[in-house]
């Protein structure tokens, strides 16, 4: 039945964003406020956990922004990237399913800079597997729920 | 039944990427290794062939990159583009369903450049129709399976 | 049944694009020509109206372009943005579901500039709610049907 299909749409919780500019895993997401919601999947320890085998469409939208009032950037040449990774509890190694992003030159000539990444793809996921999001330059993330989010919905069963 | 729905997720086969900076059709894709998979659709001659009428969600993620160790770019002003096209066997002309990309200035001041494009949309596809991917600057494509891929999954029947 | 699921894919009608560089709501879209289509949803007054409660995947692809033959840009520093908004008839306020875009420096050193945005996400929509698209710099929109479009398809019922 259509209403039993698992899904999740998780929005960034910006109260706990790491300070470095290196690639980090984002562990704080909302699952039950505003646009965020989850059904027949689990959110735990910063990971979206699959409870039901199937083929899922996965997506992520990540927005970065900088305003001159936030201070001077340590470097004007930035790699703004997202990696959607899958981890299997049985085999504790993670694999990148999707990546996207851009190198950017955010010069001091402009008072405001913005950039968004969107990735999406169709993947076979097994119960117990975990989806997580890694980004570079996390302190540049846009904390709005319409800006930085990821999600999944089940499309079909595995044969 | 959910498990009968056609789908494909095809990842770039970088062993056979054309050189040049012009627009080319990408014909080498994996369909059965790593994240690549196909069911109730066919991959042949560089095209994804529809076997079952329906409305499908189509998507593509295309990543371009350049490192200074690869040599100097012929021009620093680039058009990095993707075109998702549909060809009908009955009417041998192709039509662009979706396009995306950006003009970029990849200056020698930075040793590494990266840029990703994502497009997606919902289309009516008939059995026998073929989906293919065209890009500009194919020699700049990122060959990773998480970077450059396209796919489709059937959402519903045609009334 | 699969064939009863609502969907829409609307492509830009460029005969009526507002001028200016501010954020505007785009009200002219095709729903029944070329790739544009609609079923069990309604298009009215520039808004896509939900007729059936459910969880929908929403997406938008927005392309901007400028050629020097179009004249000089008023500013070379641009904010090229899209906002996918939801309005409820009961509560006449609009909320942004998704946003994306980039600040761009489109210098006169290049004769042609192009940039595309893609956003997508999974949202609960109720009958009577309306989806609309706002963009900045509408006069820079690419009017092709493969370039500037948005859509939705129902994935599952609400529990």
């Amino acid at each position: 039945k259509l209403e039993a299909q698992p899904f999740a749409h998780l929005t960034i919780n910006a109260t706990d964003i790491p300070s470095g500019s290196h690639k980090v895993s984002l562990s704080s997401w909302y699952h039950d406020r505003g646009w965020a919601k989850i059904s027949n999947m689990t959110f735990s320890n910063g990971k979206l956990i699959v409870n039901q085998d199937g083929f899922y469409y996965l997506y992520a939208n990540i927005c970065f922004r900088h305003h001159e009032t936030s201070g001077d950037l340590a470097t004007e040449y930035l790699q703004l990237m997202v990696y959607v990774t899958k981890t299997s509890i049985k085999i504790p190694s993670s694999h990148t399913l999707m990546k996207g992003g851009s190198t950017k030159y955010w010069s001091g000539n402009s008072e405001f800079h913005f950039y968004s990444i969107n990735v999406g793809g169709f993947f076979k996921l097994r119960s117990g597997e975990e989806i997580s999001i890694e980004v570079s330059n996390p302190s540049l993330l846009d904390p709005d729920q319409d800006a930085t989010y990821f999600g999944a919905f089940k499309v079909r069963d595995i044969d | 039944k959910l498990e009968a729905q056609p789908f494909a997720h095809l990842t770039i086969n970088a062993t056979d990427i054309p050189s040049g900076s012009h627009k080319v059709s990408l014909s080498s894709w994996y369909h059965d290794r790593g994240w690549a998979k196909i069911s109730n659709m066919t991959f042949s001659n560089g095209k994804l062939i529809v076997n079952q009428d329906g409305f499908y969600y189509l998507y593509a993620n295309i990543c371009f990159r350049h490192h200074e160790t690869s040599g100097d770019l012929a021009t620093e002003y680039l058009q990095l583009m993707v075109y998702v096209t549909k060809t009908s066997i009955k009417i041998p002309s192709s039509h662009t369903l979706m396009k995306g990309g950006s003009t970029k200035y990849w200056s020698g001041n930075s040793e590494f450049h990266f840029y990703s494009i994502n497009v997606g949309g919902f289309f009516k596809l008939r059995s026998g129709e073929e989906i293919s991917i065209e890009v500009s600057n194919p020699s700049l494509l990122d060959p990773d399976q998480d970077a450059t891929y396209f796919g489709a999954f059937k959402v519903r029947d045609i009334d | 049944k699969l064939e009863a699921q609502p969907f829409a894919h609307l492509t830009i009608n460029a005969t009526d694009i507002p001028s200016g560089s501010h954020k505007v709501s785009l009200s002219s879209w095709y729903h029944d020509r070329g790739w544009a289509k609609i079923s069990n949803m309604t298009f009215s007054n520039g808004k896509l109206i939900v007729n059936q409660d459910g969880f929908y995947y929403l997406y938008a692809n927005i392309c901007f372009r400028h050629h020097e033959t179009s004249g000089d840009l008023a500013t070379e520093y641009l904010q090229l943005m899209v906002y996918v908004t939801k309005t409820s008839i009961k509560i006449p306020s609009s909320h942004t579901l998704m946003k994306g875009g980039s600040t761009k420096y489109w210098s006169g050193n290049s004769e042609f500039h192009f940039y595309s945005i893609n956003v997508g996400g999974f949202f609960k929509l109720r009958s009577g709610e309306e989806i609309s698209i706002e963009v900045s710099n509408p006069s820079l929109l690419d009017p092709d049907q493969d370039a500037t479009y948005f859509g939705a398809f129902k994935v599952r019922d609400i529990d």
Partner: antibody, heavy 122, light 107 residues
């Protein structure tokens, strides 16, 4: 735990050179800017130089410009300060320090090395 | 370069006292000011960043305020471990400078 371990100090004659090292552990070194700060005997703190997380941006105090060079090797998690044309006024305890924010300047220095003494004397 | 002037240079106080140290910048630095504590023979320790943000692990009796050119560090109730030298440090346009320091000693 997060720490910075310094080495390379000593006594050097005026006009000569010296290289200081700072080995980082317990955090992602490649994600943060790094500073050198010095303190002359009985005096206050004196900022010397900084390098961005990726090594692309370097800034120096006027007093050391053209004489000192900051560098880093992210593969070795190590920060360096190459000092040349040293004079008695460069005598100080030298500290390496991690920038609190990797992306932005201005947030302060949250982790400091133990300090290494440089004495310039004939 | 921007000059930072701390006052007082020396401060005598007792355990439990409320102590305030002032730092003035020669021109506006917005909120780009940090405060450090240093004990003899030890490296400095970050207390406050961005004028008023408390560094993780620092006791809440420490607080910072101010913006533009005038800043203060307050210790609400001085503890035995707080006797040390305190430095302010500004950042402005790729230049960092420290104040001359304030020594807090036992009365």
């Amino acid at each position: 735990q997060v720490q910075l371990v310094q080495s390379g100090g000593g006594v050097v004659q005026p006009g000569r050179s010296l290289r200081l090292s700072c080995a980082a552990s317990g955090f992602t070194f490649s994600g943060y800017g790094m500073h050198w700060v010095r303190q002359a005997p009985g005096k206050g703190l004196d900022w010397v130089t900084v390098i961005s997380y990726d090594g692309s941006n370097k800034h120096y105090a006027d007093s050391v410009k053209g004489r000192f060079t900051i560098s880093r090797d992210n593969s070795k998690n190590t920060l360096y300060l190459q000092m040349s044309s040293l004079g008695p006024e460069d005598t100080a305890v030298y500290y390496c320090a991690k920038s609190l924010s990797g992306t932005y300047w201005g947030y302060g220095m949250d982790v400091w090395g133990q300090g290494t003494t440089v004495t310039v004397s004939s | 370069d921007i000059q930072m002037t701390q006052s007082p240079s020396t401060l005598s106080a007792s355990v439990g006292d409320r102590v305030t140290i002032t730092c003035r910048a020669s021109q506006s630095i917005s909120s780009w000011l940090a405060w450090y504590q240093q004990k003899p023979g030890k490296a400095p320790k970050l207390l406050i960043y961005k004028a008023s943000s408390l560094e993780s692990g620092v006791p809440s009796r420490f607080s910072g305020s101010g913006s533009g050119t005038e800043f203060t560090l307050t210790v609400s109730s001085l503890q035995p471990d707080d006797f040390a030298t305190y430095y302010c440090q500004q950042y402005n346009r790729y230049s960092w400078t420290f104040g001359q320091g304030t020594k807090v000693e036992i009365k």
